[in-house]
Every structure is written in structure tokens, then in C-alpha cells.
Interface confidence: low
């Protein structure tokens, strides 16, 4: 008897061809021997089956000896033998219908788990091999699991279901929320407005939830909040925000927030936690302030930053289109006595310049000592 | 400044179906919903539904899902809502509307009257 | 579904005097602080008018006679002094949650 692999929800049509290429008497029935459907004339009759209205034929067809069963929306339990009766002979197809669905959400937090389950019709042995976006093969039986989300994990994944030397395809669109950089660091030269934006690798139409910058500044002892806020369907509300520093945050997103300036006492790391609503988990961004400062106090220039810099970076004082007076991989250089000139504190990374600030250094006239 | 501009009037038989633009100017069209609202002569307001420009995501009031169809054009800058198997009490005035700064709807199209008229 | 019942459903007032008309909602419409209830103006023939958005925020452009407060499932809108020019229907809205609703409206006549 012939196979058909069909898919829930789908619609699947059951071939029943007559010799004689003209419009006949036929019926389409179960394996109880129920009638679904059949003609009278020209007309299409339905039984007492359960398919009632998702039963379904093509006239049209009829008249070249054609005389199909179109059954739409199709459910796990009409997984059959059915029986096509026509010039006194019996066509049989047994229908079996798969589904898969993901076991919860298809919106997913990073690193949390993905579960894809198969439905299956009594009897049948199938088996199931998914691919996800970025490649990755993964098998099994009734269920597939698949630990650790990754951003790369969103997309489409598309599930292959074997049964009986036949196929049929499944694609689950899984996207993974998460923030696009897990981590983002800002250079800023002090009293310069400092701009933090957090975009989502992911878009949602309605988004609501709740979130919170919490900034542990070099020089504090305890992490602080700096600002709390809602988001209703994309809109972004605040709720709370520390009056120094007053931070200012977009109505929309991406997630934006903008410090008025960078001080050395603002320089540190942030954590953002957004917590989205029926979400178990939050989404996390980590943000980090390194500010540069450069001073002339007498006869020193100092130049200094604040922040989570790397051991690698280096720090360097030049005059303007000379080389560097003093280069080190410290937070903090000065030199005595300083030439009269354009002089350039640079914070860099591998020559690459990350941070630069000028300060003029004037001529300092010595003054004749008074008999 | 923000303009919503609809279509004309229609006069539409029992079983029919309507489809009522709604022509945006003014703003970036993909930033913003655009909902729908309709009112019966004398009656109050009563909200069918909305759209994401920007993707096609539409959400609609239960109390039409299975009848109406809200659909944007993102090239034209125009926002659809189709309204099939019209009945006499569907005659109504159709509104599309959009929201200011806030959560209230600031920007309004002028209406479209449908009359459902055997 | 949230639904808002309005009262008195139509007032007569004298130019000069106040105006006030409630909104009651079945169920909260308070999230985090913010109250999402607005009101609208609605003169025959034209579209409604946003008056209040967020239970007490004055729409940009919209004379300070007109005012909005209340929060959870009370709310008032009020309108003091009432001018001549402010006959109208006036509507409250719930945008809290889907689907948004609209008050039955108060018909607002000057003497």
C-alpha cells in the first residue's frame, strides 16, 4: 500500500486515479469503512466521518478519471489506511501525519535549552535529524535537545522526519535573545557626553519587560544602580534614575543611554539586565568607561586614565609631531618641566590609538631674582 | 507634519468585503503602529486592530480575527484593513490612527464611511 | 477584556464652570507607576482629538483647562473653565492591554 508522510496543520492531497479518463462514481472511506466523502453526479457528497469539514476533492479533476481526497489542517489523529473505491476496485494510502513543535517558547534566552518534541501517530518508528542555522547536525528519536543556546543558534532550524523511505521536512524558526555584543567598552576624554547603546540581536514586535543598569565605578567600594526602566510593546519608560550621574535613556529602542559627561569618578564597569516578560532568566550586556584626564599642576604633566584597561595598552606623552617622552603600560604618566608646546596624552592598543587629549603647555618666563 | 490620509467613501451589499487604505506622510512609516478604529453612527469608538509596518505583524481584536485582514505597504507608505462578509451593522465610519510621544493615539486619518446596504 | 464605563453619559454646563466626567475601568490599568488611560475630545463630523495620554499628561497643544487624574481603575477628566467651543463627546481609552477599549462617552453641552 502506498505512504504518505503529512505534516499538522498542513493540507495533503490522496491521489485515487480510475482507468476510464471520465467523470465515475467514487468513495473515499477510512479504515473503519466510515464514508468520507464520494459523488453523486456531479455533485460531492460527505459522510459521517470525524473529516467532515476538512474533507475536501477537486472537481475539476474529476472528469480526467482524477478523484482525490484533499484532507486540510491536518491532525495526528488522522494518521489512516484510507480506501478509494472506485470501478469496483480499492486504491488503499495509509496516511501518517507528523508534527514538531518546540517545547516551549521559540523566543529563547541565550544559553538556555531548546527541546524539540515529535508527535507521532501510534505504531510508527520515525526518525528525526535537525540541522541547525549554523550547520550543526543533531539526532534523535521522539525528542531533540540542544543545550547552551548561542546567538548563531537563531534562525531556521529544519528537521527532517524518515518513516518508511519516505521524508518530510519541518523548519522551526528559533530565534535566540540576546544581547548583539556581550560586552562593549567606551573611550572617553573627560567632561566629553558618553553615548551606551545596547541593540538586541533579536526583534520582537511586542516587547515588554524591565531592566536596570547597575555601574561599579573604579574608585567606589559598591556597585550602584543607575537607572531602572520599563519597556511596553518597544516604548522604553524610566523609573528610577540616580540623580548623580543623571543619565538620560531613549524612548525606543535599541536601548539607549546617554551619561551628560565623562568624570574619572564615572570611569568602571556596567552590567545591564533586561528581564523580558513571561521570560525565566534575564539578558545580560556588560559596559565599561575608561576616561582620560590631562592636567598641568606647576611643572608636571600628567596625564592619567581611570577604568578597566588591559595590562597591553599603552600610555604615552608627546609633543605635537615628536616622538613619545614617556611611554608606559601604566594608568598614569607625567613628565617634569615640560616643553612649551601642543603636547598628546595617547592611550593605545598595539599602535592602534584608542584615546587621545591635547593640553598646550605655555613658555614659562623666568623671572630675575631682586637683589 | 504627520498626515494620515484614507480612501473614499464605499457602499458595499451583505457579504461583501471592504478595503480601507490609509496613506502616511511625515514621519519615518516604519517607526510607528498603525492602528484601526471604527464608529457606528451615534455609537462610540471601537478598536479593530494594528500593524508593524515594518515587518506585517498584525494584532487584531478577537471580535473580528477571523474577518479582518490589516496589511501595510511599506513602499507606498500606506496601511490596509480589509473587512470581508460585511453585515449591515459593520456600517460605520473607519479610522486609522497613529500614536504621538505618548500612549494615546495623537494622529487620526479623516474616516472612511462603509455602508453595508442590501 | 478591560472595559470602561463612563458617567454621567451627558452634562450640561455654563461657560465658566467646571466640568467633570469619570471613567472606571473593570480591571487595573495601572503598570509600574503609570496609569495607561487617556482621554479624547470628539466634535461631529472630525476625528477625536487626544486630550490626555497617561492618565494626567497634556497632549502638546491642548489648553491647560483641561486636566486628567486618577490611577488603578478610577479616573477623571475635567474641564475648568468650561468655554463655549468645548461641546463635544469626550472619551476615555484604555491602552494597558489588548484590545484597547474605548469609554461609551459623555456628551458635553454648553448652556
Known amino acids: 500500500k502506498k505512504v504518505v508522510l503529512g505534516k499538522k496543520g498542513d493540507t495533503v492531497e490522496l491521489t485515487c486515479t480510475a482507468s476510464q479518463k471520465k467523470s465515475i462514481q467514487f468513495h473515499w472511506k477510512n479504515s473503519n469503512q466510515i464514508k468520507i466523502l464520494g459523488n453523486q453526479g456531479s455533485f460531492l457528497t460527505k459522510g459521517p466521518s470525524k473529516l467532515n469539514d476538512r474533507a475536501d476533492s477537486r472537481r475539476s479533476l474529476w472528469d480526467q478519471g482524477n478523484f482525490p481526497l484533499i484532507i486540510k489542517n491536518l491532525k495526528i489523529e488522522d494518521s489512516d489506511t484510507y480506501i478509494c473505491e472506485v470501478e469496483d476496485q480499492k486504491e488503499e494510502v495509509q496516511l501518517l501525519v507528523f508534527g514538531l513543535t518546540a517545547n516551549s517558547d521559540t523566543h529563547l534566552l541565550q544559553g538556555q535549552s531548546l527541546t524539540l518534541t515529535l508527535e507521532s501517530p501510534p505504531g510508527s518508528s520515525p526518525s528525526v535529524q535537525c540541522r541547525s542555522p549554523r550547520g550543526k547536525n543533531i539526532q534523535g528519536g521522539k525528542t531533540l535537545s540542544v543545550s547552551q543556546l548561542e546567538l548563531q543558534d537563531s534562525g531556521t532550524w529544519t528537521c527532517t522526519v524518515l518513516q518508511n523511505q519516505k521524508k518530510v521536512e519541518f523548519k522551526i524558526d528559533i530565534v535566540v535573545l540576546a544581547f548583539q555584543k556581550a560586552s562593549s567598552i567606551v573611550y572617553k576624554k573627560e567632561g566629553e557626553q558618553v553615548e551606551f547603546s545596547f541593540p538586541l540581536a533579536f526583534t520582537v514586535e511586542k516587547l515588554t519587560g524591565s531592566g536596570e543598569l547597575w555601574w561599579q565605578a573604579e574608585r567606589a567600594s559598591s556597585s550602584k544602580s543607575w537607572i531602572t526602566f520599563d519597556l511596553k510593546n518597544k516604548e522604553v519608560s524610566v523609573k528610577r534614575v540616580t540623580q548623580d550621574p543623571k543619565l538620560q535613556m531613549g524612548k525606543k529602542l535599541p536601548l539607549h543611554l546617554t551619561l551628560p559627561q565623562a568624570l574619572p569618578q564615572y570611569a568602571g564597569s556596567g552590567n545591564l539586565t533586561l528581564a523580558l516578560e513571561a521570560k525565566t532568566g534575564k539578558l545580560h550586556q556588560e559596559v565599561n568607561l575608561v576616561v582620560m584626564r590631562a592636567t598641568q599642576l606647576q611643572k608636571n604633566l600628567t596625564c592619567e586614565v581611570w577604568g578597566p584597561t588591559s595590562p597591553k595598552l599603552m600610555l604615552s606623552l608627546k609633543l605635537e609631531n615628536k616622538e613619545a617622552k614617556v611611554s608606559k603600560r601604566e594608568k598614569a604618566v607625567w613628565v617634569l618641566n615640560p616643553e612649551a608646546g601642543m603636547w598628546q596624552c595617547l592611550l593605545s592598543d598595539s599602535g592602534q590609538v584608542l584615546l587621545e587629549s591635547n593640553i598646550k603647555v605655555l613658555p614659562t618666563w623666568s623671572t630675575p631674582v631682586q637683589p | 507634519q504627520v498626515q494620515l490620509v484614507q480612501s473614499g467613501a464605499e457602499v458595499k451589499k451583505p457579504g461583501a468585503s471592504v478595503k480601507v487604505s490609509c496613506k502616511a506622510s511625515?514621519?519615518?512609516?516604519?517607526?510607528?503602529?498603525i492602528h484601526w478604529v471604527r464608529q457606528a453612527t451615534g455609537q462610540g469608538l471601537e478598536w479593530i486592530g494594528e500593524?508593524?509596518?515594518?515587518?506585517?505583524?498584525?494584532y487584531s481584536n478577537a471580535k473580528f480575527k477571523d474577518r479582518v485582514t490589516i496589511t501595510a505597504d511599506k513602499s507606498t507608505n500606506t496601511a490596509y484593513m480589509e473587512l470581508r462578509s460585511l453585515r449591515s451593522d459593520d456600517t460605520a465610519v473607519y479610522f486609522c490612527?497613529?500614536?504621538?510621544?505618548?500612549?494615546?493615539?495623537?494622529?487620526w486619518g479623516q474616516g472612511t464611511l462603509v455602508t453595508v446596504s442590501s | 477584556d478591560i472595559v470602561l464605563t463612563q458617567s454621567p453619559a451627558s452634562l450640561a454646563v455654563s461657560p465658566g464652570q467646571r466640568a467633570t466626567i469619570t471613567c472606571k475601568a473593570g480591571?487595573?490599568?495601572?503598570?509600574?507607576?503609570?496609569?495607561?488611560m487617556n482621554w479624547y475630545q470628539q466634535k461631529p463630523g472630525q476625528p477625536p482629538k487626544l486630550l490626555i495620554y497617561?492618565?494626567?499628561n497634556l497632549e502638546s497643544g491642548i489648553p491647560s483647562r483641561f486636566s486628567g487624574s486618577g490611577s488603578g481603575t478610577d479616573f477623571t477628566l475635567t474641564i475648568n473653565p468650561v468655554e463655549e467651543n468645548d461641546t463635544a463627546t469626550y472619551y476615555c481609552?484604555?491602552?494597558?492591554?489588548?484590545?484597547?477599549?474605548f469609554g461609551p462617552g459623555t456628551k458635553v453641552e454648553i448652556k
Open positions: 490612527a497613529r500614536r504621538g510621544n505618548g500612549t494615546g493615539f495623537a494622529y
Open positions: 511625515g514621519y519615518t512609516f516604519t517607526d510607528y503602529v
Open positions: 500593524i508593524y509596518p515594518g515587518s506585517g505583524s498584525a
Open positions: 480591571q487595573s490599568v495601572d503598570y509600574d507607576g503609570d496609569s495607561y
Open positions: 497617561v492618565a494626567s
Open positions: 481609552q484604555q491602552s494597558y492591554k489588548d484590545p484597547l477599549a
